[in-house]
């Protein structure tokens, strides 16, 4: 590829560098559906934004293939626990790809936060953070799931969130 | 913009890319003021550094507008807790902007770590990690706050820290 | 340096930008050695990859000097605890450098997860996440250690992992 071609690529790269894909989505009242689906997110209001990534039904959708640092935090809390001290929470980031029918686990955490609440009326708080680099192709999607989602506490978008950026 | 202009921009970008803003600040004996203000940080010694960001009274100060991944970890611990199992810790990253009189919550976690000490040995440890992408303008500041800061344990700068880098 | 030199540097930078160093290593059955050494990691299968970094005996090895965001998560769990409720887990990222005989602590967390299990037969889960920016020279290595590693739970590479990327 000659100088002109290289020049074009550099110009292209500069422009694309200006929009290095990134997103930060925030928790909202509508995040918890109770339907067994992934968590839903705010994409525009407050701290939420999409830049070079798109969103669909809870999923960050990749438009440019590459390695991405993906992350999520969920705020957990309750008064007692639905299953008592045995309650386990699984918080994970999962990939959906057109090439495979089922979601693929990317990053997962399990926690037993309710051991902190030794009576049924005890208030407790806990938090789960996940982050890591994964390769994503254009068109692939990443979602957040929490089981048991009854223990996720939403308020103002600062305590539960989901984001990514290309590295 | 002609070839010469593009060339200058590319040279400029290459140089600025070399100093992609980043910082990592570490906990120190002076971090906990007890004054109700934000935590203070070491900016130069050991693992701490500032590159394309500045520091003022606990705050990372943005010099170049853009999207930043900001993060903080605090090491929590104690012998018992001031309010027993009801003790709640709030760890947050907050933005100060000249355009608004009050700090704005960016990323926040709440934890009830004191349930971790349930036997005669009242010693417990816990950790809180926050990270996420936010847009910051030049001149805006980010600080870390922990309530109740009596439960933050500092030692050598590896257990409690605060940082950011442009994405 | 004249236009030709600058051009070469830009071409060079574009190519190196295409391989901005990054890695994500995943937990495997062989990760826990019980030997007192660092955790070992999968580097190729599944979600694991190395790009512009190399691997040796549990260590990510830096080939290009710079600032790196390094991270690790470990999944903790058990039925009761080896030292009862007083068990403390230390999870850390450590640097090895040819210039110094001992490992240097970079990022460390301490947790007391067993307070979540109020009887010796209680199943519990917990997770520890670390991430932060550090400067690494070519040839330096980063490893993950967990004490007590008996409490680390491995399954499929999504719950315990270790990664880095240049910022």
């Amino acid at each position: 590829d000659g100088p002109a071609g290289s020049w074009e690529q550099l110009i292209q790269e500069r422009r694309s560098h200006e929009v290095n894909p990134a997103a930060h989505l925030t928790g909202a009242n509508s995040s918890l559906t109770g339907s067994g689906g992934p968590l839903l997110w705010e994409t525009q209001l407050g701290l939420a934004f999409l830049r070079g990534l798109s969103y669909h039904d809870g999923a960050l959708v990749v438009t440019k293939a590459g390695y991405y640092y993906i992350y999520s935090k969920v705020q957990l809390g309750g008064v007692g626990c639905p299953l008592g001290l045995a309650s386990t929470i699984t918080h994970g980031l999962y990939k959906r790809t057109p090439r495979y029918p089922e979601e693929l686990e990317l990053l997962v955490s399990q926690q037993s936060p309710c051991g902190r609440a030794t009576s049924s009326s005890r208030v407790w708080w806990d938090s789960s953070f996940l982050g890591g680099v994964v390769h994503l192709e254009a068109g692939e999607e990443v979602v957040v799931r929490v089981l048991d989602e009854r223990l996720v506490r939403l308020r103002d978008g600062t305590r539960s969130y989901f984001g990514a950026f290309m590295v | 913009d002609g070839p010469a202009g593009s060339w200058e921009q590319l040279i400029q970008e290459r140089r600025s890319h070399e100093v992609n803003p980043a910082a990592h600040l570490t906990g120190a004996n002076s971090s906990l003021t007890g004054s109700g203000g934000p935590l203070l940080w070491e900016t130069q010694l050991g693992l701490a550094f500032l590159r394309g960001l500045s520091y003022h009274d606990g705050a990372l100060v943005v010099t170049k507008a853009g999207y930043y991944y900001i993060y903080s970890k605090v090491q929590l611990g104690g012998v018992g807790c001031p309010l027993g199992l009801a003790s709640t810790i709030t760890h947050g990253l907050y933005k100060r902007t000249p355009r608004y009189p009050e700090e704005l919550e960016l990323l926040v976690s709440q934890q009830s770590p004191c349930g971790r000490a349930t036997s005669s040995s009242r010693v417990w440890w816990d950790s809180s990690f926050l990270g996420g992408v936010v847009h910051l303008e030049a001149g805006e500041e980010v600080v870390v706050r922990v309530l109740d800061e009596r439960l933050v344990r500092l030692r050598d700068g590896t257990r409690s820290y605060f940082g950011a880098f442009m994405v | 340096d004249g236009p030709a030199g600058s051009w070469e540097q830009l071409i060079q930078e574009r190519r190196s930008h295409e391989v901005n160093p990054a890695a994500h290593l995943t937990g495997a059955n062989s990760s826990l050695t019980g030997s007192g050494g660092p955790l070992l990691w999968e580097t190729q299968l599944g979600l694991a990859f190395l790009r512009g970094l190399s691997y040796h005996d549990g260590a990510l090895v830096v080939t290009k000097a710079g600032y790196y965001y390094i991270y690790s998560k470990v999944q903790l769990g058990g039925v009761g605890c080896p030292l009862g409720l007083a068990s403390t887990i230390t999870h850390g990222l450590y640097k090895r450098t040819p210039r110094y005989p001992e490992e240097l602590e970079l990022l460390v967390s301490q947790q007391s997860p067993c307070g979540r299990a109020t009887s010796s037969s209680r199943v519990w889960w917990d997770s520890s996440f670390l991430g932060g920016v550090v400067h690494l020279e070519a040839g330096e290595e980063v490893v993950v250690r967990v004490l007590d590693e008996r409490l680390v739970r491995l399954r499929d590479g999504t719950r315990s992992y270790f990664g880095a990327f240049m910022v």
């Epitope: - | 012998v79 807790c81 001031p82 309010l83 199992l85 009801a86 005669s120 009596r150 030692r155 | -």
Partner: antibody, heavy 119, light 111 residues
């Protein structure tokens, strides 16, 4: 100023129960732990346990389990200790002691309540 | 339970001299660089008074002639120069572990 006002001297029969009180003033009551300590004539100090006024949570010295029971009335900023099944081991001066800001010491004490057990 | 052993059981010190009281714990009372050891003074007919917390920190309002030192299992309370009003019984107390336990006390007499 911080004050802990304890109830007056008590005389009770063996096997009976008695309730001692400690009324706090001069600080935010729910922000500090309250401890109870026993002092028998010619002997040292013994920690009975603590109560967290914010929640009513209690921790007891195993030795006093079943003997002492703590409670709190936040509306009157008062903590209570019930001593039951009184025996000849129970006569003593009982103190309430406030947990300090760093909560692992007792920075203010009540004047003490003297308990006499006599048939 | 952690056993706190104080010595001596009693002590007579001349006015203006130094009084030194020792306290030994049956196991370490340290956590993350802090020692969970307190010292109290008790006079007859009065409640105990906090003098020193966390081994070496002087409680507000306590004269600077009182000082504490030590870590791990061995701790010391020093009073210098001793004054008339310091005649009392002194107790050490650990708070690292439940139940909190006190030393047997040291009775200080001023000569």
């Amino acid at each position: 100023q911080v004050q802990l006002q304890q109830s007056g001297a008590e005389m009770a029969s063996p096997g009976a129960s008695v309730t001692l009180s400690c009324k706090a003033s001069g600080y935010t009551f729910i922000d500090h732990i309250m401890n109870w300590v026993k002092k028998r004539p010619g002997q040292g100090l013994e920690w009975i346990g603590r109560i967290y006024p914010v929640s009513g949570e209690t921790n007891y010295n195993q030795k006093f389990m079943g003997k002492a029971t703590f409670s709190v009335d936040r509306s009157s900023s008062t903590v209570y200790m019930v001593l039951n099944s009184l025996t000849s081991e129970d006569p003593a001066v009982y103190y309430c002691g406030r947990g300090s800001y760093y909560w692992n010491a007792m920075d203010y004490w009540g004047q003490g309540t003297t308990l006499t057990v006599s048939s | 339970d952690i056993v706190m052993t104080q010595s001596p059981a009693s002590l007579a010190v001349s006015l203006g001299q130094r009084a030194t009281i020792s306290c030994k714990a049956s196991q370490s009372v340290d956590f993350d660089g802090d020692s969970y050891m307190n010292w109290y003074q008790q006079k007859p007919g009065q409640p105990p008074k906090l003098l020193i917390y966390s081994a070496s920190n002087l409680e507000s309002g306590i004269p600077a002639r009182f000082s504490g030192s030590g870590s791990g299992t061995d701790f010391t309370l020093n009073i210098h120069p001793v004054e008339e009003e310091d005649a009392a019984t002194y107790y050490c107390q650990q708070s690292i572990e439940d139940p909190w336990t006190f030393g047997g006390g040291t009775k200080l007499e001023i000569k």
